[in-house]
């Protein structure tokens, strides 16, 4: 009976220790889960920061290139004569002429070529902003140097370069095929596709004369 | 004795369980330490990335300022020898700017003044021909620098000189009297009189920089 009591006491102690240990394990388990969660959040934060850093690097690279170009232009621009001929508009590195006659796309192209220029090419959102502003007081369409043979072909500028998809959406007769091809015009700030055979105003463009004399 | 054996057996079981739990706690403790270490590494990584991002932002800001300075310089340098500033049209001895906003006559006049210019003045039929051609693709009205207080007063340009009668006929509200005066606008090649309080586009004009370089 004495032995039995002793054993019972030990047993109670052990049960108490076991319960205590189980409680510790449960607490550690919760802590572990919280730690895992926190770790996942940290990893997510790292991913976000890494992405942001990558984006910043890209932006910086772009700014750096812009900088180099500006420095180059600045070198050229020192001591130069008229950047553009009379009646043309000088903007940034280009000269623009808004035609005063209405012609089909091919004829408009020829008119520009005779002036040592090409039909309008939009390279950036800044170019687009300028043109949209320059034609803001007109409700007429203006041919630009963008065309394609049919809907299965890409939109190409006169120099053969493709249209950057983010620049603008082309509306209108985009799904149409015409014997003379499909050409793009800009009107009230939006770009439309239409039969190249139609007569419209146009915008000629050429490099501004920013060379050192 | 039977009870005693049973208790001993339970005690053995409990001891075994206790040892097992202690082992688990020890393992979890090690895992926790490793997790803590890994978390510290992640935090360190975050700190590094955040620092790098901050540095990149500073560099980018610097590049951006450099860029703005270069653009500013480019505009200044380029304007030195160019007959007209960017976005203006050079024709003969003048520079012309077609406003991109719609304002009343007085506000339009102020806008031109802020650009070191005046509202359009037509001195000759050649000037008129150029302007008519330049706005041929617009159906909107453009204020010019011609106004009069009421029908008993003569039409005067901004510089106080009178309108040459042979240049053009003024149509529209010629016999009307308005508290703000009567102003002239050009639209589709014809000149009209209207209440100066109305909003319209406008044409600014200033002398071209044709000094010997």
């Amino acid at each position: 009976s004495q032995v039995s009591n002793l054993l019972k006491q030990q047993q109670t102690n052990l049960t108490h220790q076991k319960n205590k240990l189980e409680g510790q394990i449960s607490a550690r388990q919760q802590a572990e889960e919280a730690s895992q969660e926190s770790q996942n959040e940290l990893k997510e934060m790292i991913e976000t920061l890494a992405w942001k850093l990558n984006e910043k690097s890209k932006e910086q690279m772009e700014l750096h290139h812009q900088n180099l170009n500006l420095q180059e232009t600045l070198k050229r621009v020192a001591n130069c004569s008229a950047p553009c001929p009379q009646d043309w508009i000088w903007h940034e590195e280009n000269c623009y002429l808004f035609s005063t006659g209405s012609f089909n796309w091919e004829k408009s192209q020829e008119k520009c070529l005779s002036l040592d220029a090409k039909l309008l090419k939009i390279n950036s959102t800044a170019d687009l902003d300028f043109i949209q502003q320059a034609i803001s007081y007109s409700s007429f369409p203006f041919w630009m140097g963008l065309s394609r043979r049919n809907p299965s072909y890409p939109w190409l500028w006169e120099d053969g370069s493709p249209l950057m998809p983010h620049l603008f959406r082309i509306r209108g007769a985009v799904s149409q095929t015409y014997p003379s091809g499909t050409c793009a015009y800009i009107q009230r700030g939006a770009v439309y596709a239409e039969n190249c055979i139609l007569a419209a105003f146009s915008i000629c463009q050429k490099k501004a004369n920013l060379r050192a004399q | 004795s039977q009870v005693s054996n049973l208790l001993k057996q339970q005690q053995t079981n409990l001891t075994h369980q206790k040892n097992k739990l202690e082992g688990q706690i020890s393992a979890r403790q090690q895992a926790e330490e490793a997790s803590q270490e890994s978390q510290n590494e992640l935090k360190e990584m975050i700190e590094t990335l955040a620092w790098k991002l901050n540095e990149k932002s500073k560099e980018q800001m610097e590049l951006h300022h450099q860029n703005l300075n270069l653009q500013e310089t480019l505009k200044r340098v380029a304007n030195c020898s160019a007959p007209c500033p960017q976005d203006w049209i050079w024709h003969e001895e003048n520079c012309y700017l077609f406003s991109t906003g719609s304002f009343n006559w007085e506000k339009s006049q102020e806008k031109c003044l802020s650009l070191d210019a005046k509202l359009l003045k037509i001195n000759s039929t050649a000037d008129l021909d150029f302007i008519q051609q330049a706005i041929s693709y617009s159906s909107f009205p453009f204020w010019m620098g011609l106004s009069r207080r009421n029908p008993s007063y003569p039409w005067l340009w901004e510089d106080g000189s009178p309108l040459m009668p042979h240049l053009f006929r003024i149509r529209g509200a010629v016999s009307q009297t308005y508290p703000s005066g009567t102003c002239a606008y050009i639209q589709r090649g014809a000149v009209y009189a209207e209440n100066c309080i109305l909003a319209a586009f406008s044409i600014c004009q200033k002398k071209a920089n044709l000094r010997a370089q």
């Epitope: 209108g172 007769a173 149409q176 015409y178 039969n195 139609l198 | -």
Partner: antibody, heavy 119, light 111 residues
Framework: QVQLLESGGGLVQPGGSLRLSCAAS????????LHWVRQAPGKGLEWVSV????????YYADSVKGRFTISRDNSKNTLYLQMNSLRAEDTAVYYC????????????WGQGTLVTVSS | DIVLTQPPSVSGAPGQRVTISCSGS????????VSWYQQLPGTAPKLLIH???HRPSGVPDRFSGSKSGTSASLAITGLQAEDEADYYC???????????FGGGTKLTVLG
């Protein structure tokens, strides 16, 4: 589905005016060129006018030039034809039709509205 | 002033093949596409063929279009009673800058 619904027809005296409307639904209105085509009683189809997506290109048949004006309101999805100085020979059923391109085919037509010019 | 020339009428028995011609010039059919429309009595015209030979969905393949030089033609095979209608050709004339229609052809299904 695509729907074009003309209205505004009726009896008018020679020299009078009338304004036709064509309400469109079931498609992106501003992505299509719109035409007016008429048909005199017992006769064939005669094209009247076309207007491009934003009204930049507008063309008329010689028979209506200077008298008729085509317009559109993209915010209201509606095409209009303002007819002035009407003549007996303008008597016809007037259809509005949509085109995916200004010079291309008419893939949808309205049911038509009758204009009668008579004294 | 009809610019595109069509025969005023054509006829054929059920099951037969008929063709409708459309003659133009270099400024319309010669340099642009041709479309064909069917107009059943008392209804609005319906597009049958576009871009010379393309059939919109829902148009039976008994209808076909072709173009050669300054002329175009519409062929209908396996003629059916419900094909009895007026048929019009259409193109764009770039010289006069307008849409041009043919005078229309009345198709009669005999029998």
């Amino acid at each position: 589905q695509v729907q074009l619904l003309e209205s505004g027809g009726g009896l008018v005296q020679p020299g009078g005016s009338l304004r036709l409307s064509c309400a469109a639904s079931g498609f992106t209105f501003s992505d299509y060129a719109l035409h007016w085509v008429r048909q005199a009683p017992g006769k064939g189809l005669e094209w009247v006018s076309v207007i491009s997506y934003q009204g930049g290109f507008i063309y008329y048949a010689d028979s209506v030039k200077g008298r008729f004006t085509i317009s559109r309101d993209n915010s209201k999805n509606t095409l209009y034809l303002q007819m002035n100085s009407l003549r007996a020979e303008d008597t016809a059923v007037y259809y509005c039709a949509r085109s995916p391109g200004l010079t291309s085919y008419h893939d949808s037509w309205g049911q038509g509205t009758l204009v009668t010019v008579s004294s | 002033d009809i610019v595109l020339t069509q025969p005023p009428s054509v006829s054929g028995a059920p099951g037969q093949r008929v063709t409708i011609s459309c003659s133009g010039s270099s400024s319309n059919i010669g340099s642009n596409y041709v479309s064909w429309y069917q107009q059943l009595p008392g209804t609005a015209p319906k597009l049958l063929i576009h871009s010379n030979s393309h059939r919109p969905s829902g148009v039976p393949d008994r209808f076909s279009g072709s173009k050669s030089g300054t002329s175009a033609s519409l062929a209908i095979t396996g003629l059916q009673a419900e094909d009895e209608a007026d048929y019009y050709c259409q193109s764009w004339d770039y010289e006069s800058e307008r849409v041009v229609f043919g005078g229309g052809t009345k198709l009669t299904v005999l029998g």
